[in-house]
Structures are given as C-alpha cells and as structure tokens.
C-alpha cells in the first residue's frame, strides 16, 4: 500500500482543516488508514482523524482544530496499521479556504432595487470576520448567457443592484462566495443559491 498523491490540506481558519490524498489502488480509507496530527507546541498531543473514502482510491479527512493563529503548525503522519506511509507538516494560515457565506436572501420590495444580503460565516472574534470580500454570481435560469459576477470589495455582506439591469419577467438565481486577501486564500465554496422572479415597472417613455 502506497500513497500516490500526497495529502494536501486546507483550513477554514476556524475549527476544521480538510486533507485529501490518493492511494495507489482502491482503499477502504476508514478501516485501513489513520491520519495523526499534532500542533507543534509544548504539551500538545497527537489527535487521530479517521478518513473517509473520496472516490475509489481517494481519501479525505476532516481535522478538528483549535481556533487557528498564524503561528500554528501541525505535523501530519499517515499510518496504515503499524506502517508509516507518509510524514509531513501543515501550516493552516498558509492554506486557507474560507467557509462559504450563508443565508443569502434577495429583497425585492425596495423600489426597483434588488438588495442581496448574506451572513458572514465567521464569528466577530475570528480574524477573518473583518477581512472577507465577496463575489456574487447572478444568472438567468432561462438564458445561460445571462451570467454575471459582482465583486463586493467592501466589508458589508450586501449588494444593491438596479432591478432594471436584469431582464424583467424571468427567474434569476444568485449565489455568493468569499475570500480573504490578507491570507491570500482560495475562494470559498459557493453558498446555496436562492431564486427570485425579477419584475419591475418599465419607465414611461418620454416623447
């Protein structure tokens, strides 16, 4: 039994890091493998993660962690029984994938303005809380070409757009994702999408 693709890990910079790797053949990850991880500090102990299958030869492990700080560094040991298959390290602050925003809501009752709001996925005491920016994706269910991205570079988790920038009388969907420039993170996953029917009053033509 050998590791084909070494573990790569990302942290949500809160409580979970996710490590994925591939074995050289079909593997029952949860029964055959264990990933041990240990914070490199005095009096820290190793914790065990039981991996799950992620495709035939793929494994994934969700590591429970303390609130992350930039100094944190973990040793990682991948074991198959008594055999050490791989040894490495992981610094969560250098491999951050933020949590996805939640509670995306489209408010359509504001005089021909669409107000999209969502929730910041972090509590106020987390460092990322005040460092997230967002991308909002809006698309038409009827027209695949009607697909747009709005970059929200301010901290407030909301976006206002004129309803007239979208077609009237058809259904749209929206979703939002986050990233943090300070840690050069990857983008989060997209939030669940929300749907609304876009309708607005056409302005009277002036003659």
């Amino acid at each position: 039994m050998k590791v084909l693709q070494e573990p790569t890990c990302v942290s949500d910079y809160m409580s979970i890091s996710t490590c994925e790797w591939k074995m050289n053949g079909p593997t029952n990850c949860s029964t055959e493998l264990r990933l041990l991880y240990q914070l490199v500090f005095l009096l820290s102990e190793a914790h065990t993660c039981i991996p799950e299958n992620n495709g035939g030869a793929g494994c994934v492990c969700h590591l429970l962690m303390d609130d992350v700080v930039s100094a944190d560094n973990y040793t990682l040991d991948l074991w198959a029984g008594q055999q050490l298959l791989w040894k490495g390290s992981f610094k969560p602050s250098e491999h951050v994938k933020p949590r996805a925003p939640g509670n995306l809501t489209v408010h359509t009752n504001v005089s021909d303005t669409l107000l999209l709001t969502w929730s910041n996925p972090y509590p106020p005491d987390n460092y990322l809380y005040n460092h997230l920016t967002y991308a909002v994706n809006i698309w038409s269910e009827n027209d695949p070409a009607d697909f747009r991205i709005y970059n929200v570079t301010y901290l407030e988790p909301s976006l206002r757009i004129a309803a007239s920038t979208l077609k009237s009388g058809i259904s749209y969907r929206a979703r939002v994702r986050a990233w943090a420039q300070c840690y050069n993170t990857t983008w989060s996953e997209w939030s669940p999408s929300t749907k609304w029917h876009n309708s607005y009053r056409e302005p009277f033509e002036q003659h």
Epitope: F41, L42, L43, E45, H47, D66, V69, A71, N73
Partner: antibody, heavy 117, light 112 residues
Framework: EVQLVESGGGLVQPGGSLRLSCAAS????????MSWVRQAPGKGLEWVSA????????YYADSFKGRFTISRDNSKNTLYLQLNSLRAEDTAVYYC??????????WGQGTLVTVSS | DIVMTQSPLSLPVTPGEPASISCKSS???????????LDWYLQKPGQSPQLLIY???NRASGVPDRFSGSGSGTDFTLKISRVEAEDVGIYYC?????????FGGGTKVEIK
C-alpha cells in the same frame, strides 16, 4: 464560553492530604492539556504540574514530584491534583488552567489551601 | 530550568502615559519556526491571572491594542501605550519553551 471551577481547598494539618478538583466546561476537555499553578499569599505565580489531553503524559516542577499527583477524568470533564505530605509552605491559592500553544489560555478562580496546625 | 527575570519590581504610572516592563530569560526562547516561546499575563487585584500576549508579540482575544509585546531570544518587553486605571495589577512573563514552565517574579503596576 470556557469555564474552570476549582474546589477542594481548605484547612489541613501539616503532613495531611487534600484532593483538589477543577470542573471544566465550554470546550472539548479531552483535547487539551491542563495545568495547575499556585500562588502563595503575597507572592508570585509558581507552575506546579501539567497533564496531556489523554492523561497519558504528566509533568511536574521538581519541588512537587513525589508529593503531588495530577490526574484527569475525561468522562467527567474534571482535572485533579492530589496533595500529600503537606507543609506550611504549600499554603497558597491553587489555580487550574487550560493549556494551549504552550501557554495558560484560560484560568479558574482558584481554591485556597491552608496548611496549619 | 529556565530562569525568568522581570524589571522593575514596581512601576508607578500616570494614566495616559506609556509604560514598559522588561523580561529576560536565562536562555533563548526563540525556536526553530521563528517564534519566541514567551507569554505575558496580567493579574488584576483580587482576580485570577489572564493571558495578554502569547508567543512574544501576539495579543490574546479581547486584549486592547494599547498592549504590545516585543523582543526576541532572551530580552522581551511589554509596552502599554497609554495606561488606563483598569490596567493596574501585577504583570508576569512566562516561558513556554520547556517544562517546567517558569514565571518572572512579577511587576506591580500602580497609579501614581
């Protein structure tokens, strides 16, 4: 919210014994090393002992080895310190603390141990 | 054991003025990853100690930004940019490089 509540302190005669407890809540107790620190009246802080999250590793300052014993019951979220062969100079407030990144991130309110005849 | 030495023993301060406390260790607290294994704690009158600064220079959650830690190796400093009345108490440094964990003797900060 992390909470640590010590108990078990009191008046004991020289040569006597006492068991201190520290009830923990607000965090996954078994994942953290824990420690005892004491403070004699009007004096500074003195580290006594620590124990790993699983209870398998214990550490003591030299002056307490053989007399004090640290232990934990993860099923009860409780840390203990057994004090034996107590002397007058062991009179102090004993604090339990949660260890993280080598440091003492959260402290209890302390329990007073008085050794006197 | 690593010996921690703090100075001054007592520090009378004026509210609004800066204050500085020194801590020296008998051996270097700088480890391989580039972090200094030194914490600062404050014990307010009648209270338990609380963590202020960890790893030499990182403020613990909820600690006001008027507190800062600096230094490396064997020489460390805790600075309060503008002292407030609520900052009175005894300040301790502690090394977290090895067991036994050892504290400095403490610096008592009081209002003039």
């Amino acid at each position: 919210e992390v909470q640590l509540v010590e108990s078990g302190g009191g008046l004991v005669q020289p040569g006597g014994s006492l068991r201190l407890s520290c009830a923990a809540s607000g965090f996954t107790f078994s994942r953290y090393a824990m420690s005892w620190v004491r403070q004699a009246p009007g004096k500074g802080l003195e580290w006594v002992s620590a124990i790993g999250g699983s209870g398998g590793s214990t550490y003591y300052a030299d002056s307490f080895k053989g007399r004090f014993t640290i232990s934990r019951d993860n099923s009860k979220n409780t840390l203990y310190l057994q004090l034996n062969s107590l002397r007058a100079e062991d009179t102090a407030v004993y604090y339990c603390a949660r260890l993280l990144r080598g440091g003492l991130w959260d402290w209890g309110q302390g329990t007073l141990v008085t050794v006197s005849s | 054991d690593i010996v921690m030495t703090q100075s001054p023993l007592s520090l009378p301060v004026t509210p609004g003025e800066p204050a500085s406390i020194s801590c020296k260790s008998s051996q270097s607290l700088l480890e391989g990853q580039g972090y200094n294994r030194l914490d600062w704690y404050l014990q307010k009158p009648g209270q338990s100690p609380q963590l202020l600064i960890y790893l030499g220079s990182n403020r613990a959650s909820g600690v006001p930004d008027r507190f800062s830690g600096s230094g490396s190796g064997t020489d460390f400093t805790l600075k309060i940019s503008r002292v407030e009345a609520e900052d009175v108490g005894i300040y301790y440094c502690m090394q977290t490089l090895q067991t036994p964990l050892t504290f400095g003797g403490g610096t008592k900060v009081e209002i003039k």
